[in-house]
């Protein structure tokens, strides 16, 4: 996240790390459902492990904290990488979580975004860019949806409605560890950090992150059929 | 230097067990999933499962019931066990590494086992 | 059930031709899709993986595409070396699944 806050402690008890070993974050994720998170289909590793209830990066133990494995990662089968479409993915987990004041599931929005619409995004990725810098704890930036047309002027030929752009001012946007993790607006989960330009933070290049609301059966089904 | 290395009899008797080691060298089988494949003679790749370093366990679903995989991180091995073996069994059995991007990007050189009384 | 059917089984090239091999998924597995060479008497060698990814240390002239259900390997001048035979392989998912693997595509002198 370029330029913005750590987050108030407890206040984003959905957001998931994604590690590589031995405690490598390379992504977030969302707890979505007791045993099922939600992250960037671009995010798919065969073997990593799972961090929720965790202020900050390093891998110091915290009192809230809780570690799972993802025992199945399903892909959304319209994603093709390396492209951005349709980039999501859920993850099982190989036990249900033990709801805490850290650790709690978020509501998937089944409402488009409007233009204008205030949301939170939040993250463990570089502060910093193209240089990178990693926070010391989770930090939470305020953005704005934009509207399709500003989203589509601002990156010709490479948006549909899977996707939607949000940004505040030049100088502020999610970037590089931040994919995956949770846009939060009105209480619900509206998206997931997906892609932008690079390097990040530029003017006229907002961040671009998955629309969830064009997910919800996709998601609800998904985790039915493998519950 | 990272490499695999399978072993176990040449020879099984039919409905007898087959047992198979893939020693690991070069990387610690925390970081990595782990597959088991065969081919018989003649013929194509047959997937039979994956093992996570969490212990966790997939398997081909043909494979279920018969195959038994497991692994021992401390000696750096992955192990096969196969039950009431048939001729049909017959094959060259691989262990390999997931590259963590679903690709098997280290084989080990394969052995050979031959069902036959 | 994702199955992998591979075309054609079996074909006859030249050095310097232009060769392709496909590979079908019975449903969409993404980018999810690996491509092996395998020589006789050898272990097989990554040569592509997430459908587009060269491997390191494979020859440029290996090219994969496809996304979906649809994917092409593509060998753009044919070497003396790369007379094997070639498989797919699906990472989409292993749930109820009989094999990853495709059929194979063996490619002969002609």
């Known amino acids: 996240i370029i330029n913005g806050s750590d987050c108030d402690m407890h206040t984003q008890p959905w957001q998931a790390a994604l590690l590589l070993r031995p405690n490598q974050l390379y992504c977030g994720a969302v707890l979505v459902h007791p045993q099922w998170l939600l992250t960037a289909a671009h995010c798919r590793k065969k073997v990593f492990r799972v961090r929720l209830g965790h202020y900050s990066l390093s891998p110091v133990y915290e009192s809230g904290q809780q570690m799972f494995q993802g025992v199945k990662s399903i892909p959304h089968p319209g994603y093709s990488h390396p492209g951005h479409s349709n980039d999501l993915m859920l993850i099982k987990l190989n036990r249900r979580i033990r709801p805490t004041k850290d650790v709690r599931p978020i509501n998937v929005s089944s409402h488009c975004p409007s233009a204008g619409t205030k949301c939170l995004v939040s993250g463990w990725g570089t502060t910093k860019s193209p240089q990178v810098h990693f926070p010391k704890v989770l930090q939470c930036l305020n953005i704005s949806v934009l509207s399709q047309k500003r989203c589509e002027d601002a990156y010709p030929r490479q948006i549909d409605d899977t996707m939607f752009c949000a940004g505040d001012k030049a100088g502020r946007d999610s970037c590089q560890g931040d994919s995956g993790g949770p846009v939060v607006c009105n209480g619900s989960l509206q998206g997931l950090v997906s892609w932008g330009d690079y390097p990040c933070a530029r003017p006229n290049r907002p961040g671009v992150y998955t629309n969830l609301c064009k997910f919800t059966k996709w998601i609800q089904e998904t985790i039915q059929a493998n519950s | 230097e990272v490499q695999l290395q399978e072993s176990g009899p040449g020879l099984v008797k039919p409905s007898g067990t087959l047992s198979l080691t893939c020693a690991v060298s070069g990387f610690p089988l925390s970081n990595y999933a782990m597959s088991w494949v065969r081919q018989p003679p003649g013929k194509g790749l047959e997937w039979i499962g994956d093992?996570?370093?969490?212990?966790?366990?997939d398997y081909a679903s043909w494979a279920k019931g018969r195959f038994t995989i497991s692994q021992d991180s401390s000696k750096n091995q992955v192990s096969l066990k196969l039950s009431s073996v048939t001729a049909a069994d017959t094959a060259v059995y691989y262990c390999?590494?997931?590259?963590?991007?679903?690709?098997?990007?280290?084989w080990g050189q394969g052995t050979l086992v031959t069902v036959s009384s | 059930a994702y199955d992998m059917t591979q075309s054609p089984s079996s074909l006859s090239a030249s050095v310097g031709d232009r060769v392709t091999i496909t590979c079908q998924a019975s449903?969409?597995?993404?980018?999810?899709l690996a491509w092996y060479q395998q020589k006789p008497g050898k272990a097989p060698k990554l040569l592509i993986y997430?459908?587009?990814t060269l491997a390191s240390g494979v020859p440029s002239r290996f090219k994969g595409s496809g996304s979906g259900t649809d994917f092409t390997l593509t060998i753009s001048s044919l070497q003396p070396e790369d007379f094997a035979t070639y498989y797919c392989?699906?990472?989409?998912?292993?749930?109820?699944?009989?094999?990853?693997f495709g059929g194979g595509t063996k490619v002969e002198i002609k």
């Open positions: 093992i996570y370093p969490s212990d966790i366990i």
């Open positions: 390999a590494r997931d590259n963590n991007d679903y690709g098997l990007d280290i």
């Open positions: 449903q969409s597995i993404s980018s999810w």
């Open positions: 392989q699906q990472g989409y998912t292993n749930s109820n699944i009989i094999n990853t």
């Open positions: 997430l459908a587009s």
